[in-house]
């Protein structure tokens, strides 16, 4: 029962984590304009892995994709790669773990096979989580480095752009989503690995021994214990996520033409 619960919980935690990694990768708020000690601008800049956006005080938001590949900083490319690898590994891990779940019966699949699949998916989740954490951390380090540099915009020269206004960028919401999501995927992977140990049939290092007592003989054969409890908790996971960047004057989000006050 405990093994099944651990496996199921590991799967759910990993699922949430991978959904978070995907969300973080797609989010535009990896870095947001630093408003502390800055002149209050009527425009708010924020940047993601794939595009940079500007939200005007008027509410008009304009996003531009990074249409160049060679012009991008190597670090940004590395972060993209880490996040994509994390998503791919996580997705494969989820696929494998679905078939490995003890509560799901697929033909006459042996417990040993399910144990191996559980371990495989667990390792994949751990690596996926580490990739996401590494990617987010590399980006955060890049931001910190750029924050103190005189050329405040970390994408100076990208796509032929020339930096003239000193705009400093700080951590965006996506970084925190990424760290948490990576951590959850990692925890889920560890839980899957722990569950794998309990799923594997116990192999004994000794053979059956016959004891001959006076009068009658009884043979004791140590056998493996097999849990037959099913995992029946219907866990519905709904991820509510708001990736809106907030400025110093904003108090709430609202579905109007502009969300900047």
């Amino acid at each position: 029962m405990a093994v099944t619960a651990c496996q199921g919980l590991g799967f759910v935690v990993s699922l949430i984590g991978i959904a978070g990694i995907i969300a973080a990768t797609c989010m535009d708020q990896w870095s947001t304009q630093d408003l502390y000690n800055n002149p209050v601008t009527a425009v708010f800049n924020y940047q993601g892995l794939w595009r940079s956006c500007v939200r005007e005080s008027s509410g008009f938001t304009e996003c531009r994709g990074y249409f160049t590949l060679l012009g991008l900083p190597a670090m940004l490319q590395a972060v993209r790669a880490l996040m994509i690898v994390g998503i791919v590994l996580g997705a494969i891990g989820l696929l494998v773990s679905i078939f490995a779940l003890k509560c799901i019966r697929i033909g006459s699949m042996e417990d040993s096979a399910k144990a191996n699949m559980t371990l495989t998916s667990g390792i994949m989740f751990i690596v996926s989580g580490l990739c996401a954490i590494a990617g987010v951390s590399v980006f955060a380090n890049m931001l910190v480095t750029n924050f103190w540099m005189s050329t405040a915009n970390m994408y100076t020269g990208m796509g032929g752009m020339v930096q003239t206004v000193q705009t400093r960028y700080t951590f965006g919401a996506a970084l925190f989503v990424g760290w948490v999501a990576g951590g959850l995927t990692l925890i889920g992977g560890v839980m899957m690995c722990i569950a794998c140990r309990g799923l594997a049939p116990e192999e004994t290092n000794y053979k059956a021994v016959s004891y001959h007592a006076s009068g009658h003989s009884v043979a004791y054969k140590p056998g493996g214990f097999k849990a037959s409890t099913g995992f029946g908790s219907n866990t519905k996971n709904k991820k509510i996520y708001d990736g809106g960047a907030r400025t110093e004057d904003e108090v709430q989000s609202y579905p109007s033409k502009h969300d900047y006050v």
């Epitope: 002149p39 209050v40 009527a42 940079s52 008027s58 008009f60 206004v165 108090v251 609202y254 006050v261």
Partner: antibody, heavy 118, light 113 residues
Framework: EVQLQQSGPELVKPGASVKMSCKAS????????MHWVKQKPGQGLEWIGY????????KYSERFKGKATLTSDKSSSTAYMELSSLTSDDSAVYYC???????????WGQGTSVTVSS | DIVMTQSPSSLTVTAGEKVTMRCKST????????????LTWYQQKPGQSPKLLIY???TRESGVPERFTGSGSGTDFTLTISSVQAEDLAVYYC?????????FGPGTKLERK
Amino acid sequence: EVQLQQSGPELVKPGASVKMSCKASGYTFTGFLMHWVKQKPGQGLEWIGYINPYNDGTKYSERFKGKATLTSDKSSSTAYMELSSLTSDDSAVYYCARLDYGNAMDYWGQGTSVTVSS
Amino acid sequence: DIVMTQSPSSLTVTAGEKVTMRCKSTQSLLNSGNQRNYLTWYQQKPGQSPKLLIYWASTRESGVPERFTGSGSGTDFTLTISSVQAEDLAVYYCQNAYYYPLTFGPGTKLERK
């Protein structure tokens, strides 16, 4: 058609207060910031501040903090500006203007003339 | 606060003439995020409300005649009227639309010769 209709001229005594209105029509009132601008006779334009009609968030120029109070009424699509402790320096035409692309004020009211005189 | 200066303060023109007026800001109005200059030009005729002519330094507002052209970047901007018409006689204001408080230039008055 977008229109900003402002209230009529005001003649007030020094030290008094005045509240002027700006009724919006032809667009979603809560979807745009409403800015207010002052223009003294024969002089240039001076930004007072803005109100976000959606959540009543405001931002004021330092010069007008404590002088101007911006409010809005969603039900009537009207923005208001109240000026307190009036002096002769407050005699001017006050405009309301809608903010759009490029942080540009694309539609302006006809202006409310305020004359402070004893 | 950003200070906007305009030159000349007044211009005497004749119909059909090409007119250029300048606007200077104490800080760059170029936003790095979208490479747009947040400078706006308004026209105010006597006894009327200001009218939007150009935003983003060079984007003409719909309905504004093509003879009005905005240019410049950073701190230096220009409004050009290729062929002045009688109805263009007005005061032209430039405005910083990048930093709060939003600030206007003192204006350039276009007068008939």
